[in-house]
Amino acid sequence: QSPPGKPEIHKCRSPDKETFTCWWNPGSDGGLPTNYSLTYSKEGEKNTYECPDYKTSGPNSCFFSKQYTSIWKIYIITVNATNEMGSSTSDPLYVDVTYIVEPEPPRNLTLEVKQLKDKKTYLWVKWLPPTITDVKTGWFTMEYEIRLKSEEADEWEIHFTGHQTQFKVFDLYPGQKYLVQTRCKPDHGYWSRWGQEKSIEIPNDFTLKD
């Protein structure tokens, strides 16, 4: 039996800059019942506060609802582990909510086979930003990637589209079925998961010409 090992805050994420969650790895419990508490302060402020909600985001987490989330302020967050033999505190984690956004994937993915005047066929991929993000006002600047592969292929082909919400894919094989997904990433933030898979078959009666 011993004091608890040092916990580590390993991840903080926000879906929308309005709420966020931080998760920690507990470290060893020293073979004893161990309590964990997360405390935080904000830069330039002297007060220290305890986690407002340990339940919403599951074990070893702290959820900050709208009421407790400020942007343009750096949070200094630590986790303390205590058992009857002693206590241990994590290194402080400095968090700016505007840098930890992991949005929902883009929505309304649409696929359309089109043909140019020279009879060259392409797949026109279009999508919309995730619902939660207010891209028009510049509250979020979003970058996108699409990935596609034929049903038989093992590897995805990834295209970075910048801020564009549409993309044309050329040199596809007639008669093949293609799977397509999109994801997005805000400035400074994290890539969303890949969105729902859509598929389309390139018709055989379109002829590809180089």
């Epitope: 580590e8 390993h10 991840k11 903080c12 790895n25 830069e43 330039g44 750096i74 290194d91 984690l93 400095y94 968090v95 700016d96 505007t98 840098y99 930890i100 990433k185 994290y190 890539w191």
Partner: antibody, heavy 120, light 107 residues
């Protein structure tokens, strides 16, 4: 405790490439962005670029876009920077530096630096 | 690119002095400025972030004032271990840039 381990020195030929390593320990490698900074003898500091070890997303200083390539190996918690087409201008100390938190780019932990000498 | 100018390359000081090191940004950077200390043969060490916040473990004799384009790192009651190079850095817009450094020397 947090440590960023870098080899002390590399002697390389002009025109060749070198791959510098930075082994991180004492924290979860994928949590923080890693940066690379150049310092020529007796001179100031120049930011080369940054990489997010969680997904290898990177940003570069345009000045180093064709010179440096940043990669990571999550399994060994190691960040790498490859420098290509080396000239005497590339002789410098190169530091890896960990982002201070989940936020803006200030650097709370630095490696000891690798001195790269480009010489025939 | 934003240029960070530290006009004093060298400053002669005495132990116990109050020293002010200045840094000027070529464009508005808000409070997105950090300060580092570098001793000979060592890597830089973070002192201040967000223009005025001392990093964990940094003695309170180090303070920063300023926002916008003009920043000053003040060391009160200078200690011999404070003799080093000091660099400012902006992280307001890419690429992140550093000042040229100010070296504190003994008179």
């Amino acid at each position: 405790q947090v440590q960023l381990q870098q080899p002390g020195a590399e002697l390389v030929m002009p025109g060749s490439s070198v791959k510098l390593s930075c082994k991180a320990s004492g924290y979860t490698f994928t949590t923080y962005w890693m940066h690379w900074v150049k310092q020529r003898p007796g001179q100031g500091l120049e930011w080369i670029g940054e990489i997010d070890p969680s997904d290898s997303y990177s940003n570069y200083n345009q000045k180093f876009k064709d010179k440096a390539t940043l990669t990571v190996d999550k399994s060994s918690s190691t960040a790498y920077m490859q420098l290509s087409s080396l000239t005497s201008e590339d002789s410098a100390v190169y530091y890896c530096a960990r982002n201070g938190g989940l936020g803006p780019a200030w650097f709370s932990y630095w490696g000891q630096g690798t001195l790269v000498t480009v010489s025939a | 690119d934003i240029v960070m100018t530290q006009s004093q390359k060298f400053m002669s000081t005495t132990v116990g002095d109050r020293v002010s090191i200045t840094c000027k940004a070529s464009q508005y950077v808000g409070t997105a400025v950090a300060w580092y200390q570098q001793k000979p043969g060592q890597s830089p060490k973070l002192l201040i972030y967000s223009a005025s916040n001392r990093y964990t473990g940094v003695p309170d004799r180090f303070t920063d004032s300023g926002s916008g384009t003009d920043f000053t790192l003040t060391i009160s009651n200078l200690q011999s271990e404070d003799l080093a190079d000091y660099f400012c850095q902006q992280y307001s817009s890419y690429p992140w840039t550093f000042g040229g450094g100010t070296k504190l020397e003994i008179k």
